[in-house]
C-alpha cells in the first residue's frame, strides 16, 4: 500500500513536468530506495541543479524567456566549482549569456533568481565589465586567461546556458 | 550641442570599396555605442553596423557582414565605415548614429546629416 | 529576425485632428515591464529623429502632442493634434534583439 501511493505520488510529479520535459533521467540519491533525483534529458547534473546549453541564438531577454518556458532561468553561477563543471560543456569559440545582468547601467549587477551579487565568488576577465552600455553578462573563452565573464550588449544574440533545480521524485 | 558630420561617400563601381567617416563633437565620443544605419533611394531605414566604445565588440546583419568594418578612433572622435565587395543594393544614404542604452534595449537618439553612396557601373 | 509591421502607409490627417499609426512586431519584444520599441520621424532631406522610446517614453524636446503606447507585438503612435510641421515619414523600430529592424514607414500628410 505505501509502495503503491509513494508510486502514485511520482507518477502525478511525473505528470506536472511532461509539458516541457517528455523525459527524465533519474538517479538514486543515497541507500535509500525512495529518494529519486532527476534531470530532463538530455540536461547535465551538478549537485542540486540541471544544466542545458542552448545553442539557439538569441538576445539575452530572449535568453531568459527561453529557460523560463523550460521551468529554469539564465544559469546563477555560485562557487567556482559551479563553473568548472558548466565550462567542461562550453565550446571555446562561443559565447554564451549568464543570468546577470545590469539593466539600469550603474553598475550594479543583479542575478536572475535575485541571489545576491558576491562581488568575492565573480569570475569576470581581467578588466571586465569596461563598459556601462553592455548590460548583460557571457562566459567566454580568453587564451590567455581561459574561461570567464564579460559584459556585451544585451541585444547581440548569444548561445545561453539555463539552470533549474533538480526534480525530487 | 551635438554633432555628426559624414563624409566619404561617392559614386563607386560594383566590387569596389569606400571609406566612410563620421566626425563627432559636443559628445564625450570615447564613451559612446555608435552605429551607421542607411536608407536606400526611397526605402526605409536598414541597421547597418555597430561598435561599442572601447572599439573590442563590433556587430553587423548578414547582408553586409564580411563586407563591412566598423572602427573607430577615439582620439580622433571619429567612427569609420570601411565598405568592400560593394553591390549595387548598397546604394543609400549613409547616417551615423550615436546609441544609448534603455536597460536591455537602445535608441539611436543622435543623427548625421548622412552621406550618400551610389554603386553603379 | 523580427519584423516590424508598419500600418497605413499613408494617413491624411486634418489640421488639429488626430493621428494614429500601428506597429506590429512578429515577436513580443517585451521583457519585466519594458517594450523595446522605438519611434522616429523623418522629415524629407533631412535624417530621423527620435521621438519616443521603450514604446512610451517622450525623448526630451519633443512635444507632448506624441504619445506611444503598446506591448507585446502591437504599438500605436499617436499624435494627438495633427500640426503643419508633423508632416514626415514616421517609423518604428525594435531593439530586443539584433538585428534590429525598422517598420517600412507611415507617411503622414495634411488633408
Known amino acids: 500500500n505505501f509502495m503503491y501511493s509513494k508510486t502514485v505520488k511520482r507518477l502525478s510529479k511525473l505528470r506536472e513536468y511532461q509539458q516541457y520535459h517528455p523525459s527524465l533521467t533519474c538517479v538514486m540519491e543515497g541507500k535509500d530506495i525512495e529518494d529519486w533525483s532527476c534531470c530532463p534529458t538530455p540536461w547535465t547534473s551538478f549537485q542540486s541543479s540541471c544544466y542545458f546549453i542552448s545553442t539557439g541564438m538569441q538576445s539575452w531577454t530572449k535568453s531568459q524567456k527561453n529557460c523560463s518556458v523550460m521551468g529554469a532561468d539564465l544559469v546563477v553561477i555560485n562557487t567556482r566549482e559551479e563553473q568548472d563543471f558548466i565550462i567542461q560543456n562550453l565550446k571555446r569559440n562561443s559565447s554564451y549569456f549568464l543570468g546577470l545582468s545590469d539593466p539600469g547601467g550603474r553598475r550594479h549587477w543583479q542575478w536572475v533568481d535575485q541571489t545576491p551579487y558576491n562581488e568575492n565568488v565573480t569570475f569576470w576577465h581581467s578588466g571586465e565589465p569596461n563598459n556601462l552600455d553592455e548590460r548583460c553578462a557571457i562566459i567566454n573563452f580568453r587564451s590567455s586567461e581561459e574561461w570567464g565573464w564579460n559584459d556585451i550588449h544585451c541585444h547581440v544574440p548569444q548561445k545561453s546556458i539555463c539552470k533549474m533545480k533538480k526534480i525530487y521524485i | 550641442e551635438v554633432q555628426l558630420l559624414e563624409s566619404g561617400g561617392g559614386l563607386v563601381q560594383p566590387g569596389g570599396s569606400l571609406r566612410l567617416s563620421c566626425a563627432a563633437s559636443?559628445?564625450?565620443?570615447?564613451?559612446?555605442?555608435m552605429s551607421w544605419v542607411r536608407q536606400a533611394p526611397g526605402k526605409g531605414l536598414e541597421w547597418v553596423a555597430t561598435?561599442?566604445?572601447?572599439?573590442?565588440?563590433?556587430y553587423y546583419p548578414d547582408s553586409v557582414k564580411g563586407r563591412f568594418t566598423i572602427s573607430r578612433d577615439n582620439s580622433k572622435n571619429t567612427l569609420y565605415l570601411q565598405m568592400n565587395s560593394l553591390r549595387a543594393e548598397d546604394t543609400a544614404v549613409y547616417y551615423c548614429?550615436?546609441?544609448?542604452?534603455?536597460?536591455?534595449?537602445?535608441?539611436?537618439?543622435?543623427w548625421g546629416q548622412g552621406t550618400t553612396v551610389t554603386v553603379s557601373s | 529576425d523580427i519584423v516590424m509591421t508598419q500600418s497605413p502607409d499613408s494617413l491624411a490627417v486634418s489640421l488639429g485632428e488626430r493621428a494614429t499609426i500601428n506597429c506590429k512586431a512578429s515577436?513580443?519584444?517585451?521583457?519585466?515591464?519594458?517594450?523595446?520599441v522605438n519611434w522616429y520621424q523623418q522629415k524629407p532631406g533631412q535624417p530621423p529623429k527620435l521621438l519616443i522610446y521603450?514604446?512610451?517614453n517622450l525623448e526630451s524636446g519633443i512635444p507632448d502632442r506624441f504619445s506611444g503606447s503598446g506591448s507585446g507585438t502591437d504599438f500605436t503612435l499617436t499624435i494627438s493634434s495633427l500640426q503643419a510641421e508633423d508632416v514626415a515619414v514616421y517609423y518604428c523600430q525594435q531593439s530586443d534583439e539584433d538585428p534590429w529592424t525598422f517598420g517600412g514607414g507611415t507617411k503622414v500628410e495634411i488633408k
Open positions: 548614429a550615436t546609441y544609448r542604452p534603455y536597460y536591455y534595449g537602445s535608441v539611436l537618439d543622435y
Open positions: 515577436q513580443s519584444v517585451d521583457y519585466d515591464g519594458n517594450s523595446y
Open positions: 559636443g559628445i564625450t565620443f570615447s564613451t559612446y555605442t
Open positions: 561598435i561599442n566604445s572601447g572599439g573590442d565588440n563590433t
Open positions: 521603450g514604446a512610451s
